[in-house]
């Protein structure tokens, strides 16, 4: 292990299409991968008229955009599908939207998925 970096071994799992995909709807996902790769957690969601609809959560591939991010935060301005990733066990339990280009307050507080 490399000191000073949060190892990701498991992430919160969620699949909105669990019935169609024949997966669990929610749970904890162990993160596997090649030994030389970093692993991350992620969350994908939509904002439908102010209501948060989670699409997926789980483990994510080695991705430089996720390095050293302890919190799962989407920074893109008004995407149709929100995405964030982070490092650290279960770091995707909560996720936030803080658009980089805006000066105003964030449009949504950190979100915790409903069980």
């Amino acid at each position: 292990a490399i000191l000073g970096r949060s190892e990701t071994q498991e992430c919160l799992f969620f699949n909105a299409n669990w019935e169609r995909d024949r997966t669990n709807q929610t749970g904890v996902e162990p993160c596997y991968g090649d030994k030389d790769k970093r692993r991350h957690c992620f969350a994908t969601w939509k904002n439908i008229s102010g209501s948060i609809e989670i699409v997926k959560q789980g483990c994510w591939l080695d991705d430089i955009n996720c390095y050293d991010r302890t919190d799962c935060i989407e920074k893109k301005d008004s995407p149709e599908v929100y995405f964030c990733c982070c490092e650290g066990n279960m770091c995707n339990e909560k996720f936030s939207y803080f658009p980089e280009m805006e000066v105003t307050q964030p449009t949504s507080n950190p979100v915790t998925p409903k069980p």
Epitope: R20, C31, G33, F42, C59, L61, N65, V81, Y82, F83
Partner: antibody
């Protein structure tokens, strides 16, 4: 070194069956989801089916649903594709490919493929 | 199903050229976009995953960009070994779908 080796392809008549195998080595097979992707002669890539690391979850393209069955034997490090009721349009090179998770399915390693020809 | 549209379907370029291939999804797929390189008679090879991440062993002249519906694969300085067909693929939703491919040929 990661290696995937497909076998079981060949010539079969319409309505016939074939079972493809993919032998995996060089990685912990039971940690990874696996997929079958095919490519008809001179055409592009078409995803066929996928299975998660322990065989609990499977998914199929509409074009093969009800005819093809994906499975795996982690004790043998082998992925399978049972193909029934084969049609001429199933003629293709079939590749097995490794994926890390069900939801971030970048296919990072591929076998060299096995040719399935469906013809009378 | 999510449709993936690549353009152009083919292009001619010279060694050293900067080459750009685009891929458009029929709906937003966030960053669930991968690029593959395939040479005749060979299996596809992963080049870019998660829209921007370089796969292991792939030269840094390859780069990916985009999110949502519009994505780009760029080869900054085309090398002889880069002449091949390139495919985009979405992994946002089942079924996984590929673009029709872009054949990069020698001018």
């Amino acid at each position: 070194e990661v290696q995937l080796l497909e076998s079981g392809g060949g010539l079969v008549q319409p309505g016939g069956s074939l079972r493809l195998s993919c032998a995996a080595s060089g990685f912990t097979f039971s940690d990874y989801g696996m997929n079958w992707v095919r490519q008809a002669p001179g055409k592009g890539l078409e995803w066929v089916s996928g299975i998660n690391y322990n065989g609990g979850y499977t998914s199929y393209a509409d074009s093969v649903k009800g005819r093809f069955t994906i499975s795996r034997d982690n004790s043998k490090n082998t992925l399978y594709l049972q193909m029934n009721s084969l049609r001429a349009e199933d003629t293709a090179v079939y590749y097995c490919a490794r994926a890390a998770n069900w939801h971030d399915t970048a296919l990072d390693y591929w076998g060299q493929g096995t040719l399935v020809t469906v013809s009378s | 199903d999510i449709q993936m549209t690549q353009s152009p379907s083919s292009l001619s370029a010279s060694v050293g050229d900067r080459v750009t291939i685009t891929c458009r999804a029929s709906q937003s797929i966030s960053r669930y976009l991968n690029w593959y390189q395939q040479k005749p008679g060979k299996a596809p090879k992963l080049v870019i995953y998660a829209a921007t991440s370089l796969a292991s062993g792939v030269p840094s002249r390859f780069s990916g960009s985009g999110s949502g519906t519009d994505f780009t694969l760029t080869i900054s300085s085309l090398q002889p070994e880069d002449f091949a067909t390139y495919y985009c693929q979405q992994s946002y939703d089942n079924p996984l779908t590929f673009g029709g491919g872009t054949k990069v040929e020698i001018k």
